[in-house]
Interface confidence: low
């Protein structure tokens, strides 16, 4: 899978979405979750209601929730309050039985407020993932890269 | 194989000036995070400031915020830190690192470059 | 900041358990997960991750290794200590800007 990276605003709102194929994964719940390591597990966050034909429905855990339209083939998972440790890289799954699969990597980054006149360095952004060598990148304004452009060019 | 190679260091007068490079190999540069992380003779580690894939985005700590600037180069692969107004206390071996996922808290330093010596003295 | 504090050495036998101790005045959990990570430094080298995330073993590393712990107490286990072992350890934690421990040196009896 290419990963495509989501930017948000410190203390804002975050939408994630991970489309996918309603027919194939019909009757499937969903989750998100968090990739700790190249290897490593991907650590449950929150996952679609029990009732698969309840998934519209909105589930929290914390400041995470997430929504499935099962008829429109979008999985969305809204990020509250977005804080630094909320950056990292996550998955989107349909689960069926024990298994997983996954739907869309995705890399959170949070951007400093610009309004906020606290120095930019209070807010710590660390470092990126092994599997991220063919990135796209969805700003929360809906701008994608083309494969091979530099994600985040600089400003300054 | 990634390798992270480290160039600039060497003896410099207290209030001038150095420029540290590391050219990175063996990985697609652009994608990930960078890092310095220095050490004083016969001390701990300590991180310095971290870089965002496009440099858009970088940090440091307290003792070095204005005197120090972390950027890198992506079509050369290159990472760099340009050090101000240098003081004695900066004597340290820099090194170049990695860093494992992009976020905020921290993630880890996966690769380590082998480091360059800075020292500060008149 | 948060403050890590290791103790300074520690020396034991070939073949024994070393156990070496970080402890943050500050939680670095976070959604269940401990941003507590720990490298090892031999004498003239860069440093190298071990344990990353409190407890998975990095790429390549021995299963002599091991982490455990969470929240402000962490734990580094290296056993049986061989004798390439001997290095300064660190911890290091993720959970705000990345600080390190002050070291430990692991010395053989």
């Known amino acids: 899978h290419n990963t495509t990276v989501f930017q948000g605003v410190a203390g804002q709102s975050l939408q994630v979405s991970c489309p996918y194929d309603s027919m194939k994964h019909w009757g499937r719940r969903k989750a998100w979750c968090r990739q700790l390591g190249e290897k490593g597990p991907c650590q449950r966050v929150v996952s679609t209601h029990n009732l698969w034909l309840l998934s519209f429905l909105r589930r929290w855990n914390g400041s995470t929730a997430i929504t499935d339209d099962t008829l429109g083939g979008t999985l969305t998972i809204t990020l509250r309050n977005l804080q630094p440790h909320d950056a990292g890289l996550y998955q989107c799954q349909s689960l069926h039985g024990s298994e997983a699969d996954t739907l869309r990597k995705v890399l959170v980054e949070v951007l400093a407020d610009p309004l906020d006149h606290r120095d930019a360095g209070d807010l710590w952004f660390p470092g990126e993932s092994e599997s991220f060598e063919d990135a796209h990148v969805e700003h929360s304004i809906s701008r994608s890269l083309l494969e091979g452009e530099i994600p985040f060019p600089p400003t300054s | 194989e990634v390798q992270l190679v480290e160039s600039g260091g060497g003896l410099v007068q207290p209030g001038r000036s150095m420029k540290l490079s590391c050219a990175a190999l063996g990985f697609t540069f652009s994608n990930y995070y960078m890092a310095w992380v220095r050490q004083a003779p016969r001390k701990g580690l300590e991180w310095v400031a971290s870089?965002?894939?496009?440099?858009?985005?970088?940090y440091y700590r307290d003792s070095v915020k204005g005197r120090f600037t972390i950027s890198r180069d992506n079509a050369k692969s290159t990472l760099y830190m340009q050090m101000d107004s240098l003081r004695s206390e900066d004597t340290a071996t820099y090194y170049c690192v990695r860093s494992f996922i992009v976020g905020t808290t921290g993630y880890y330093f996966d690769y380590w470059g082998q480091g360059v010596m800075v020292t500060v003295s008149s | 900041d948060i403050v890590l504090t290791q103790s300074p050495a520690l020396a034991v036998s070939l073949g024994q358990r070393a156990t070496i101790s970080c402890k943050t005045n500050q939680n670095v959990d976070y959604y269940g997960n401990n941003y507590m990570h720990w490298y090892q430094q031999t004498p003239g080298q860069q440093p190298k991750l071990l344990i990353y995330?409190?407890?998975n073993l990095a790429s390549g590393i021995p299963a002599r290794f091991s982490g455990r712990g969470s929240g402000t107490d962490f734990t580094l286990t290296i056993d049986p200590v061989e004798a390439d072992d001997t290095a300064t350890y660190y911890c290091q934690q993720s959970r705000n800007l990345p600080t390190f421990g002050g070291g430990t040196k692991l010395e053989l009896k």
């Open positions: 870089i965002s894939t496009g440099g858009d985005n970088t």
């Open positions: 995330f409190a407890s």
